[in-house]
Amino acid sequence: NFMYSKTVKRLSKLREYQQYHPSLTCVMEGKDIEDWSCCPTPWTSFQSSCYFISTGMQSWTKSQKNCSVMGADLVVINTREEQDFIIQNLKRNSSYFLGLSDPGGRRHWQWVDQTPYNENVTFWHSGEPNNLDERCAIINFRSSEEWGWNDIHCHVPQKSICKMKKIYI
């Protein structure tokens, strides 16, 4: 039976991911029963990605490592809509590392996944970035401008946002 063999296949796939994420929340995409997309529970999902707000305070490098051991990266923000989704889950009195850094301090910002840095799709607070020694980016809330990005020293511990591609089963 086709449906039975599909289910068995799905269950064996789920087992593969269990050591990293004991529970996945899956949805059927579109009308095609073949397409199930999953995010770890309790990550949130938006379009083709899953997001996790890490409340532990760590340096940028340790935050990226923390994301990577879950199969994710520090968040790469590609659109205003994506940022608007992300900020719904953030606390106004906290700052969160993004997957954006300027390792050489030459204002050559780069995303962790090599997505090209596009000046037209950036959400820096006004006056930011403003310090060549501040080589990592955070997102935080300023009452005058709401949510935006700021450059800070990479070693200063912050919360962070992890992003991964959805898991397809």
């Epitope: 796939k13 994420h21 051991v69 199969g71 990266d73 962790v112 996944d113 991964m164 591609k165």
Partner: nanobody, 123 residues
Framework: QVQLQESGGGLVQAGGSLRLSCAAS????????MGWFRQGPGKDRAFVAA????????SYADSVKGRFTISRDNAENILYLQMNSLKPEDTAVYYC????????????????WGQGTQVTVSS
């Protein structure tokens, strides 16, 4: 079941270059960190390079650092290994492999393997 098929191996002179490819059978390619391993005559299978799901993180064996580059094309479901400055000791069968979610360097962490492609470097 993820099926992996390597190509691009062959005979090359020392100092030359080759680019290996590994085509994956399905769109769940992005569920997996990917790796290259090699097995020389009479040797165990050894780690060469690995890359995370998004391509953001890579890891290399000391013996290939600075000479080999691993990359992936998630739109086309293909893994690559660019091999430059090849040496006779790089002669081996090269395998690509898939590990669920997280980049690993040990063969046991990889669930799916290709059949391998032979690389021979002559002096």
């Amino acid at each position: 079941q993820v099926q992996l098929q390597e190509s691009g191996g062959g005979l090359v002179q020392a100092g030359g270059s080759l680019r290996l490819s590994c085509a994956a059978s399905e769109r769940t390619f992005t569920n997996y960190a990917m790796g290259w391993f090699r097995q020389g005559p009479g040797k165990d299978r050894a780690f060469v390079a690995a890359i995370s799901r998004s391509g953001s993180s890579t890891s290399y064996a000391d013996s290939v650092k600075g000479r080999f580059t691993i990359s992936r094309d998630n739109a086309e479901n293909i893994l690559y290994l660019q091999m430059n400055s090849l040496k006779p000791e790089d002669t081996a069968v090269y395998y690509c492999a898939a590990a669920p979610l997280v980049l690993k360097t040990t063969p046991g962490a990889y669930n799916y393997w290709g059949q391998g492609t032979q690389v021979t470097v002559s002096s």
